[in-house]
Structure formats: C-alpha cells, structure tokens
C-alpha cells in the first residue's frame, strides 16, 4: 500500500520496506537515492529521531565519468536480532544543498509467538504452605492468554480463564512441576517447567527436657512433611558469644557448630560433651527424602554449673606450736563453674573433725586448741562452686615446723577455742 507521497524534488528512488516478524529475526531496511553531484550522507530515523549508533552501510555508485553526473546511493540498515525496542517507523534523511529530504516511512513491527518476560522458577516450599508462582508473556499480537499446568495437567478449562500472571498455590504435599502456556493469535509458547520441591515444615517448640553440666536433653515437635516421612533431624549447638550470642533468626554463628543427628521418632536428643555452666544456642531442622526443612530460630540454653572435678593441688600443712600453716593451689581438674571458695577439714586422732569455709583464699593459719599436743593431725581441702563441693583431697598430715623453713605470708586466722563449729550454708 502507498505510504505518503514522494516529494517532487526528492532524490529518493527507494524507501524502507516493512519488517514484521518474531523476536530474533534479522532483516535489512534500505534507502535508494539518485542524486546529481556529490552524494550526501544518509541518516536513519526511527520515529523521527536520528539513530546515532545505527548498524548501517552506505554504498555509492557513479553513473558517469564526470563529478557532476548522477550517483546512486544505497544505504542499508541492518537489524540483527529484532527486539521490541527496534519497532517503529523508519525513514532516511539527507541534506542536499540547503534542503532536507526524508524518505517515505517503513515500519518495523514485532509479531510472533508469545515471548516470556517471566517464567516460573524452581523453588522449595514447606509442605502445606501457600506460595505464588509468576508467569508473564507478551506479543505482539496481543492479547496473550496464559494457561497454568500442574504436573502437565491444565489448571483451567481454557487459556485466559484461570489465573494469569500470578498463580496462588494453597499448599502442596508432594513435589510437583508447574509450567505456563502463553496463547496468542500466532500460536502457543510453553514456559520452562519449574520443579517445586516439598520440604518438611520447620520443627516447632524446640525446648529443654533436662540439663546436666555437660549434657542437655532437648525435644521438639516435627512439622508436616507431606507424603515424605522424615528420615532424621539434625541439631546444632554453638557456644554463645559471651552470652551476647545469636539473636533469634540472625545469620549463622561464626564458630563451627556442634552437629548431632537424631533418628526419628522420638523427636528428642541428648547432647553430650558440652561445657558446664556455658551458654549455648541450639537449633533443629528435619529432613525427608526431598531435603531438609529450614532451621528453627536459635534457642538460647545454658548448661548448669557442676562441682569441681578434682581436689585442690599441692597442699602443704606445717605446725609450729599451737599454730598450723596450710596452703594449696586451685584444682587442675575442671571447676565446672565459678569457684566460690574452699572448705578445709582437720582432725586429730582422738578429736572430732573441724570444718571451715575458707572463702577464695588459698592459705590459712589455724590456731590449734590446747597446747598443741593433739597427735596425728591431718588436713583435707575441697573446692566448691554453687553446685556443691568437689572431691576432698587426701588427708595431708601436719608436719612439724623446722627452723629455717619459710613461713607463708598470711593473715592470722584465730579459730574460736570452743570446739563448737557452725556448719556452712550448704
């Protein structure tokens, strides 16, 4: 069909044609001119705007020997892979003398099978949990109607009758595939097939069942896992960072977590080899044949204090008259808590045992009753925490002090002369 009128003085003897096709099409638009004298540069316009970076070539053919003879000029604009942005009205423009000439227009249009702007993506979802899938397609030609398919079965009676850009799935109990068909006047395009993998739901109600200094027993309630039974659950424990630790839902902690697997059921696990009196964070995830659930939030827990695991070390006891000097060092064995102090017990062969709470000092001077003639006096020391006493040391006999033997620097503690003893708080 005619497109405008060739201007009387127009040098154009050929105008751009029409290109209509599907995306990716390659085509060429041409302008042909016959001019007298020096040939002009041909510019290309799209929708009236000069194309600065056009992929164009210009060929000039002289029709005579003389400079002033006619020339044929052919400018070719190549469209390498047709896109929506290429569509529009194309014209050639030349400047000849003081005049501007524009060719008749040609049109580039996009028309073909629907083109997907968005396709459903593979994803994992928890069993029985709602989610949405997206699909978007365009022509031209419009309209484009979508038809969703689940496991290759259409979810509507006809294209355009069911959900369009977004498909709401109320929940799945088995791994399924979803795709979408885009229909227009030119035909049908099918999207990629997205696999939606059904994983177990996140476990709930992670809690402590019992606590011991080096062990915690925890339990949880499993989430739904669709048609796939749970194979095991994985529990992670990590040392909290000075009690500041990980807030619920924060990223993974920096330290390598202690990981344990639990056969299920029961949904319970004893976590051993922990540090006493230590804050931890724990979380759990459960796994089916389809993969693991998401982790629960980190739950802060703490092991209780234990009693020291060994007696104080290097106990020495010397006697000088009615005084006895006793000193010792902190147990080498784990304290399993915060050391609150030491208890000391001494006893003669025929006298009752005397118990003392020394506090955190590691030496004591005892004022012995009477003239110091008590025979076979022995001393025992134990460390204690809030959880109780650690083991007592073996009895250390009181040695007689020899001149020249160094005496410990200490604060003299004078014990009451009465044999009565006030038992400590424990």
């Amino acid at each position: 069909a005619p497109r405008g009128t060739q201007a009387e003085e127009s040098p154009f003897v050929g105008n751009p044609g029409n290109i209509t096709g599907a995306r990716g099409l390659t085509g060429t638009l041409r302008c042909q001119l016959q001019v007298q004298g020096e040939p002009p540069e041909v510019h290309w316009l799209r929708d009236g705007q000069i194309l600065e970076l056009a992929d164009s070539t210009q060929t000039q053919v002289p029709l005579g020997e003389d400079e002033q003879d006619d020339w044929i000029v052919v400018s070719q604009l190549r469209i390498t892979s047709l896109q929506l942005s290429d569509t529009g009205q194309y014209q050639c423009l030349v400047f000849l003398g003081h005049q501007t000439f524009v060719s008749q227009p040609g049109y580039v249009g996009l028309e073909g099978l629907p083109y997907f702007l968005e396709e459903p993506e593979d994803r994992t979802v928890a069993a029985n949990t709602p989610f949405n899938l997206s699909c978007q397609a365009q022509g031209p030609p419009e309209p484009v109607d979508l038809l969703w398919l689940q496991d290759a079965v259409p979810l509507a009676t006809a294209p355009g009758h069911g959900p369009q850009r977004s498909l709401h799935v109320p929940g799945l109990n088995k791994t399924s595939s979803f795709s979408c068909e885009a229909h227009n006047a030119k035909g049908v395009t099918t999207s990629r097939t997205a696999t939606i993998t059904v994983l177990p739901q996140q476990p709930r109600n992670l809690h402590l069942v019992s606590r011991q200094p080096t062990e915690l027993e925890v339990a949880w309630t499993p989430g739904l896992s669709g048609i796939y039974p749970l194979t095991h659950c994985t529990l992670q424990a990590v040392l909290s960072d000075d009690g500041m630790g990980i807030q619920a839902g924060e990223p993974d902690p920096p330290e390598e977590p202690l990981t344990s697997q639990a056969s299920v059921p029961p949904h319970q696990l004893r976590l051993g080899s922990l540090h006493p009196h230590t804050p931890y964070h724990i979380r759990v995830a459960c796994t089916s044949s389809q993969g693991p659930s998401s982790w629960t939030h980190w739950l802060p827990v703490e092991t209780p204090e234990g009693v020291p695991l060994g007696p104080p070390e290097n106990i020495s006891a010397t006697r000088n008259g009615s005084q006895a000097f006793v000193h010792w060092q902190e147990p080498r064995a784990p304290l399993q808590g915060t050391l609150l102090g030491y208890r000391l017990a001494y006893q003669g062969q025929d006298t009752p045992e005397v118990l003392m709470d020394i506090g955190l000092r590691q030496e004591v001077t005892l004022e012995l009753q009477g003239d110091g003639s008590v025979s076979n006096l022995t001393v025992c020391v134990a460390a204690y925490t809030a959880a109780g006493d650690g083991p007592w040391s073996l009895p250390v006999p009181l040695e007689a002090w020899r001149p020249g033997q160094a005496q410990p620097v200490h604060q003299l503690v004078k014990e009451p002369s009465t044999p009565a003893f006030s038992w400590p708080w424990w």
Epitope: T5, S10, Q32, Q34
Partner: antibody, heavy 120, light 107 residues
C-alpha cells in the same frame, strides 16, 4: 485491485511517430513512479523510460533518448509515451509498469501491453 | 551500463524438483536484483526484489539469494504452474537492464 491498461499501439512506418497511453486505477497514482518496458519479438525485455511520481524527473536509455518523451497527468491517472523517429528496433510489445515503494526501479505491477510494429 | 547475464536459456525440470536459476551482473549491484516470471501471453509478474524480498502473494517456494554480482532464484519444489520464462533485472541504477531470460520447461 491495481490495474494498468495500455493503448495507442499499432503499425507505423520507419521515421513515424506514435503516442502510447496507460490508464491506471486501483491505487494512488500520484504516489508512484512509473516506467515503460518493452519486449522484443525475441522475448528480450528492455527498459524504455522512467518518470517520478510528480513527473519532475524522467530518465531514458541512450537508445531512445531524444526520440521518446514520457509524461503523466496525475489528475487523469494517465501516462503518456510520445515516440518519434521510430525504427524497426522499436518494434515490440510496450508495457507500462508501476515502481515499488522500496525501489522505484523494480516494477511490481505491469499492464497487458500494447503492440508497436515499425515496418514499411 | 550494467549487463545482466542469465547463462541458461533453458532449464529442464520435473514437478517436485528443486531448481535454481542464476544471474550474473557485470558489476556489484548491492543486492538490487529483481526476478520476474512471465507465462505465455501474459505480462511479467514480480517475484522477488532486493535479491531476497518476496513480493506480496508470491508462494514461499520461491526464494531469492545472492550478493555482489551473483544472484539465484530457487524454486524449492517445482509445480506445473511454475513452468514459465524467468527474467532477472538490476534495479540499482538507470539504465535499468534485464537478463535475456531462462525458460523453465518439463524434462
């Protein structure tokens, strides 16, 4: 429907003249360049003349230059080819043809032709 | 002037065959080549222009190709109604010139 109808052909003596016409219909005549092409008895095709849509530009091959004149009347949708000094080489079937929009020198529609015989 | 040479005056073919008619220009014509079909008693009909652009209504069994000086018209599966005279033409510049024609006939 594009329609081109030539007329005015006939028998003419060498050195004589003849005027051919071409009546166009079915398209916007003033928007198209037109050409005359002839076909010799040996079936060879020869281009004879070209005229731009407004009639301001005409081109001829050397074989007819100075002897043939191509003109158009856009108001009447008619082309004219005035031929003089005819010789036996001009004996042919003469077709008027419309130039395509994409190249005026390629011809998308042709008339049925009018026969010109130059003979004594 | 640009000379267009169709080396085969005649080409024999059978219905259903693929046939290629060639045309050579005496200089580069920048793909400005048209192909015409003419049946006995009829005027020429445009098939192809700009070497490969199919004219409206032309069956897609007709395809044009080529560049520079060498051009080809291919009929992918010859039909009985395709038996005719085929001309090439350069539409680059005046004087416009045609090939001598190739007659496609039955074997």
């Amino acid at each position: 429907e594009v329609k081109l109808v030539e007329s005015g052909g006939g028998l003419v003596q060498p050195g004589g003249s003849l005027n051919l016409s071409c009546a166009a219909s079915g398209f916007t005549f003033s928007s198209y360049s037109m050409s005359w092409v002839r076909q010799t008895p040996e079936k060879r095709l020869e281009w004879v003349a070209f005229i731009s849509n407004g009639g301001g530009r005409t081109y001829y091959p050397d074989t007819v230059k100075g002897r043939f004149t191509f003109s158009r009347d856009n108001a009447r949708n008619t082309l004219y080819l005035q031929m003089s000094s005819l010789n036996s080489e001009d004996t042919a079937m003469y077709f008027c043809a419309r130039g395509t929009t994409e190249s005026y020198y390629a011809m998308d529609y042709w008339g049925q032709g009018t026969s010109v015989t130059v003979s004594s | 002037d640009i000379v267009m040479t169709q080396s085969h005056k005649f080409m024999s073919t059978s219905v259903g065959d693929r046939v290629s008619i060639t045309c050579k220009a005496s200089q580069d014509v920048i793909t400005a080549v048209a192909w015409y079909q003419q049946k006995p008693g009829q005027s020429p009909k445009l098939l192809i222009y700009w070497a490969s652009t199919r004219h409206t209504g032309v069956p897609d069994r007709f395809t044009g190709s080529g560049s520079g000086t060498d051009y080809t018209l291919t009929i992918s599966s010859v039909q009985a109604e395709d038996l005719a005279l085929y001309f090439c033409q350069q539409h680059l510049s005046t004087p416009l010139t045609f090939g001598a024609g190739t007659k496609l006939e039955l074997k």
